[in-house]
């Protein structure tokens, strides 16, 4: 059986093509995100109180792409935008310069292949998430190993160091 570590997550670079307010939820955005596939993915994010709508447009983000799609207030969300998070503040993680939609995020010490879809019953995401943090340089890490786009660099929060990621 595969180890439960960050290699199980399908983390990819995406570009938000459009973002709008969710029609039925004041705290949610609905985004169309290019992740290097034939069609964009619809993503629902609870970022309204943290990121102005205009800052969501054409933004490069990191997406968790193998969560089981789930309806959020009636809209099917097909991925999750990764953010540094504390009770007071949320910052969208930024990919390295030169990243393009579809680029995979890898972890030097954890070389496995991601699951096609994370089995919600096995709570794999829930077991991995507590070990996701930004470090003292705001670099996104799993157990201290950076989120890396090979040949391009590491992913970062803007200002949030030693913070959780979700």
């Amino acid at each position: 059986s595969k180890p439960i570590d960050v290699s199980r997550l399908d983390l990819r670079i995406g570009c938000i093509i459009t973002a709008r307010k969710h029609p039925d939820a004041d705290s949610l955005y609905v985004e169309e995100v290019d992740v290097g596939e034939i069609a964009p993915r619809t993503v629902v994010s609870g970022l309204v109180n943290h990121v102005p709508l205009e800052q969501m447009q054409n933004r490069m983000v990191i997406l968790l792409c193998n969560l089981k799609p789930a309806k959020m207030r009636g809209v099917l969300s097909q991925a999750m935008v990764m953010c540094a998070s504390s009770p007071e503040k949320i910052e969208i993680l930024a990919p390295p310069n030169g990243s393009v939609p579809g680029d995979r995020i890898t972890f030097d010490a954890f070389p496995g292949e991601p699951d096609k879809e994370l089995n919600p019953k096995k709570k794999i995401w829930e077991q991995i998430q507590p070990d996701l943090h930004t470090n003292d340089e705001c670099v996104a890490t799993y157990k201290g190993v950076p989120f890396e786009v090979k040949g391009k660099g590491v992913c970062r929060a803007q200002t949030m160091s030693n913070s959780g990621i979700k």
Epitope: E88, N135, D136, N162, S163
Partner: antibody, heavy 118, light 112 residues
Framework: AVHLVESGGGFVQPTESLKISCAAS????????MYWVRQAPGKGLEWVAR??????????YYADSVKGRFTISRDDSKSMVYLQMDNLKTEDTAMYYC?????????WGQGVMVTVSS | DIVMTQGALPNPVPSGESASITCQSS???????????LNWYLQRPGQSPHLLIY???TRASGVSDRLSGSGSGTDFTLKISSVEAEDVGVYYC?????????FGSGTKLEIK
């Protein structure tokens, strides 16, 4: 493998200056904050200085005991970190360690001895 | 500055017995994130220190599961069950909540 190798230690008199260096290899140096920690003979560990990375404007932080006398700097092109020590005092006598830390991954050099005595 | 105070061990500790090292901080190290910003280090004789535990209770890579960290916002314990020869050295707690970073004075573990 990760290596941090300090150099430049030695014997100096009070009020004199010394610059110690740390050569890093085996990890992406430009992405890592770097620290100096010292240990006086027979004593405990004392944090001395920290320098952040380029995206964080190479911001520096110092212990009160060395503020205004010590300067930490780095050269990402050479994977080097430095500690310039001016107006040295006898109480600065210590083993100086170069270190970097990111949760599970914790790197320390072997240390370099600095002795300040008249 | 945050002051870190470590307790002494009744030295030496008999081989195979457990040892508990205590550390107190002058200010709570519990961050609003729910994490406690405390590290534990071991410095073996003649060696550089190395990290054992971060976030108060998370073992670093390669650290034996005989070591465990626990505590509250200001009172912390590092427990070593079934002490072995490789555990000998000086143990330091360190806070990384705010600058300046501060260490405890160290607790020496010797084995009988």
């Amino acid at each position: 493998a990760v290596h941090l190798v300090e150099s430049g230690g030695g014997f100096v008199q009070p009020t004199e200056s010394l610059k110690i260096s740390c050569a890093a290899s085996g990890f992406t140096f430009s992405d890592a904050a770097m620290y100096w920690v010292r240990q006086a003979p027979g004593k405990g560990l004392e944090w001395v200085a920290r320098i952040r990375t380029k995206p964080n404007n190479y911001a520096t932080y110092y212990a009160d005991s060395v503020k205004g006398r010590f300067t930490i700097s780095r050269d990402d092109s050479k994977s080097m970190v430095y500690l310039q020590m001016d107006n040295l005092k006898t109480e600065d006598t210590a083993m100086y360690y170069c270190t970097s830390w990111s949760y599970d991954f914790d790197y320390w050099g072997q240390g370099v001895m600095v002795t300040v005595s008249s | 500055d945050i002051v870190m105070t470590q307790g002494a061990l009744p030295n030496p500790v008999p081989s195979g017995e457990s040892a508990s090292i205590t550390c107190q901080s002058s200010k709570s190290l519990l961050h609003s994130s729910g994490k406690t910003y405390l590290n534990w280090y071991l410095q073996r004789p003649g060696q550089s220190p190395h990290l054992l535990i971060y976030w108060m209770s998370t073992r670093a890579s390669g650290v034996s599961d005989r070591l465990s960290g626990s505590g509250s916002g200001t009172d912390f314990t590092l427990k070593i069950s079934s002490v072995e020869a490789e555990d000998v050295g000086v143990y330091y707690c360190q806070q990384f909540l705010e600058y300046p970073l501060t260490f405890g004075s160290g607790t020496k573990l010797e084995i009988k």
